[in-house]
């Protein structure tokens, strides 16, 4: 084919089209080149800038034989997913001899429906409370209008003249569904439908009304709970750990706690089989049939002390001349408190009652006087605490001492120190 | 409205020479490339000249290089194909077309088209 | 040269049917395929260029489609004004050449 008389004049015989389309659509861009003699490379760029790491395909096919024949050649740029950043005028470039050569620009451009950068999220809110909702779209084209809808029906008579971003509801009383529709030129796009569950308000005023060694009784007041009635309200009781501890609003106890189911009405229940003395963490949480509402702070209570459940055991009581020993160990059985001491009584066949406090100690010496005319005397121990005293061990005779046997009492009782109390007998 | 009016046709006899004209409107002539294609009385469509928008570069099929010569006059909006050496197998209907932007190989716009007789 | 095969001269169809005609190139012309329509008295005019590429103002009824060497131009839904002569070009290199034409008529 005859040469051109213009060197100057450019290659391209083919340039960058337009693309415009919605986001993730496809494209090519091509550029086709007839030269004299070694191809070129092609190179793209965008907004003037070269394209590193364009996707693109060089083809070249030489149109004879001859070295200095002409070669068509043709680059082919694909946008794989048409995204905002793909957007810019194309062209090719080539270094041809001295002379660099562009081909006439190409544009890409995102037009289509809108796009949603944010959607309403699916969420439980409890009854009566404010929240908010996004939802958040772009074009091109511009401007994107945004027509909330609650449970298909319009917020506002017309696009963009409603809330538009964010969505500020005062408050459900029943579950509720939600979405946006996003209005531009191009047409309309609607967001998925968030769900929005009611569930029942957090229960308020958490409190004792009574309170027993092995038992406490709690009561709260109800959180609103929109159309749901409230099916069954759960209390969870937490053994105080001195160590980590509880702290008000803390979301999950550090071990297993203790759960019970409360029927409802009344919202009171009464927490049996607790031990006696012991710091509790409580909380509660109401269910309708929308769900639970979330859990009251952690209150601290503590259980009051009890007596000791059984008496002193191994009680021995020996004479040995003018003096008895008594002494004894601590009830197996639990103490239901911090233990405060012991009690001791004696007491003759027809001789009035005597009580002792002895205190923390598990042994006492009593100095016997008297003519010998009291006989069959007797000891009982009790431990106490602070709520009162335990129950008192069997009567122990009080044996005259003799080596390997101990020997009867022919003496009256004297205590070294005067009884504390003195209380009825059984 | 893009307009391409062919002129210059006419019988001629083989081996004589005939100048065809192509007045272009509607479109800024001078940034597009040009062809002349013709079609033979058994409606085959064959390629016969191009050239640039500067007119620099011109191509031909081998069966017409040497015979016709394309040239342009983009102040006048006009494309110009001389003919020469005409053989009876140059009968047909000649058509100016346009090259699109994206491929100046593909024709985006023809003329009505100019009728050229070769016979004796 | 790049040889052009239209295999069918003629094809025959009824009003609303899809059809397609095709066109096969001697070597793989990249995708630079150009499909023209011609009616009776008239000059060609440009459908699909770039095999796929449809040009200003053809109804999208008409697409393009092919890769190396095998290329299509299928009519969705045929109308009346569609039945005409229809040319495939390659428009990769000079010189260009087209197929022999396929005439569209109805049954």
């Known amino acids: 084919a005859p040469r051109g008389t213009q060197a100057e004049e450019s290659p391209f015989v083919g340039n960058p089209g337009n693309i415009t389309g919605a986001r993730g659509l496809t494209g090519t861009l091509r550029c086709q080149l007839q030269v004299q003699g070694e191809p070129p490379e092609v190179h793209w760029l965008r907004d003037g800038q070269i394209l590193e790491l364009a996707d693109s395909t060089q083809t070249q096919v030489p149109l004879g034989e001859d070295e200095q024949d002409d070669w068509i050649v043709v680059s082919q740029l694909r946008i794989a997913s048409l995204q905002l950043s793909d957007a810019g005028q194309y062209q090719c470039l080539v270094f041809l001899g001295h002379q660099n050569f562009v081909s006439q620009p190409g544009y890409v451009g995102l037009e289509g429906l809108p796009y949603f950068l944010e959607e309403p999220e699916d969420r439980t809110v409890a009854a009566n409370t404010p929240f908010n909702l996004s939802c958040q779209a772009q074009g091109p084209p511009e401007p994107v209008d945004l027509l909330w809808l609650q449970d298909a029906v319009p917020l506002a008579t017309a696009p963009g003249h409603g809330p538009q971003r964010n969505l500020h509801v005062p408050g459900l009383n029943k579950t509720s569904s939600f979405s946006c529709e996003a209005h531009n030129a191009k047409g309309v796009t609607t967001s998925r439908t968030a769900t929005i569950t009611v569930l029942p308000q957090q229960p308020r005023n958490l409190h004792l009304v009574s309170r027993q060694p092995t038992e406490l009784e709690v009561a709260w007041t109800p959180g609103l709970s929109g159309i749901y009635p409230l099916t069954h309200c759960t209390l969870q009781a937490m053994l105080s750990d001195n160590e980590v501890g509880i702290q008000a609003g803390e979301p999950d106890p550090p071990e297993e706690p203790l759960t019970l189911q409360a029927s409802v009405p009344p919202h009171q229940l009464r927490l049996g089989s607790l031990h006696p003395h012991t710091p509790y963490h409580i909380r509660v949480a109401c269910t309708s049939s929308q769900g639970p509402s979330s859990w009251t702070h952690w209150l601290p209570v503590e259980t009051p002390e009890g007596v000791p459940l059984g008496p002193p055991e191994n009680i021995s009581a020996t004479r040995n001349g003018s003096q008895a020993f008594v002494h004894w160990q601590e009830p197996p059985a639990p103490l239901q408190g911090t233990l405060l001491g012991y009690r001791l009584a004696y007491q003759g066949q027809d001789t009035p009652e005597v009580l002792m406090d002895i205190g923390l100690r598990q042994e006492v010496t009593l100095e016997l006087q008297g003519d010998g005319s009291v006989s069959n005397l007797t000891v009982c121990v009790a431990a106490y605490t602070a709520a009162g005293d335990g129950p008192w061990s069997l009567p122990v005779p009080l044996e005259a001492w003799r080596p390997g046997q101990a020997q009867p009492v022919h003496q009256l009782v004297k205590e070294t120190s005067a009884p504390a109390f003195s209380w009825p007998w059984w | 409205e893009v307009k391409l009016v062919e002129s210059g046709g006419g019988l001629v006899q083989p081996g004589g020479s005939l100048k065809l004209s192509c007045a272009a409107s509607g479109f800024t002539f001078n940034s597009y490339s040009m062809s002349w294609v013709r079609q033979t009385p058994e409606k085959r469509l064959e390629w016969v000249a191009y050239i640039s928008n500067g007119g620099g570069r011109t191509y031909y099929p081998d069966t017409i290089k040497g015979r016709f010569t394309l040239s342009r006059d983009n102040d006048r909006n006009t494309l110009y194909l001389q003919m020469s050496s005409l053989k009876s197998e140059d009968t047909a209907m000649y058509y100016c077309?346009?090259?699109?932007?994206?491929?100046?190989?593909?024709?985006?716009?023809w003329g009505q088209g100019t009728s050229v007789t070769v016979s004796s | 040269d790049i040889v052009m095969t239209q295999s069918h001269k003629f094809m025959s169809t009824s009003l609303g049917d899809r059809i397609s005609i095709t066109c096969k190139a001697s070597q793989d012309v990249i995708t630079a395929v150009a499909w023209y329509q011609q009616k009776p008295g008239q000059s060609p005019k440009l459908l699909i260029y770039w095999a796929s590429t449809r040009h200003t103002g053809v109804p999208d009824r008409f697409t393009g489609s092919g890769s190396g060497t095998d290329y299509n131009l299928t009519i969705s839904s045929v109308q009346a004004e569609d039945l005409a002569l229809y040319y495939c070009q390659q428009h990769f290199s000079t010189p260009l050449t087209f197929g022999a034409g396929t005439k569209l008529e109805l049954k």
């Open positions: 077309a346009r090259g699109t932007t994206e491929s100046y190989y593909a024709l985006d716009y």
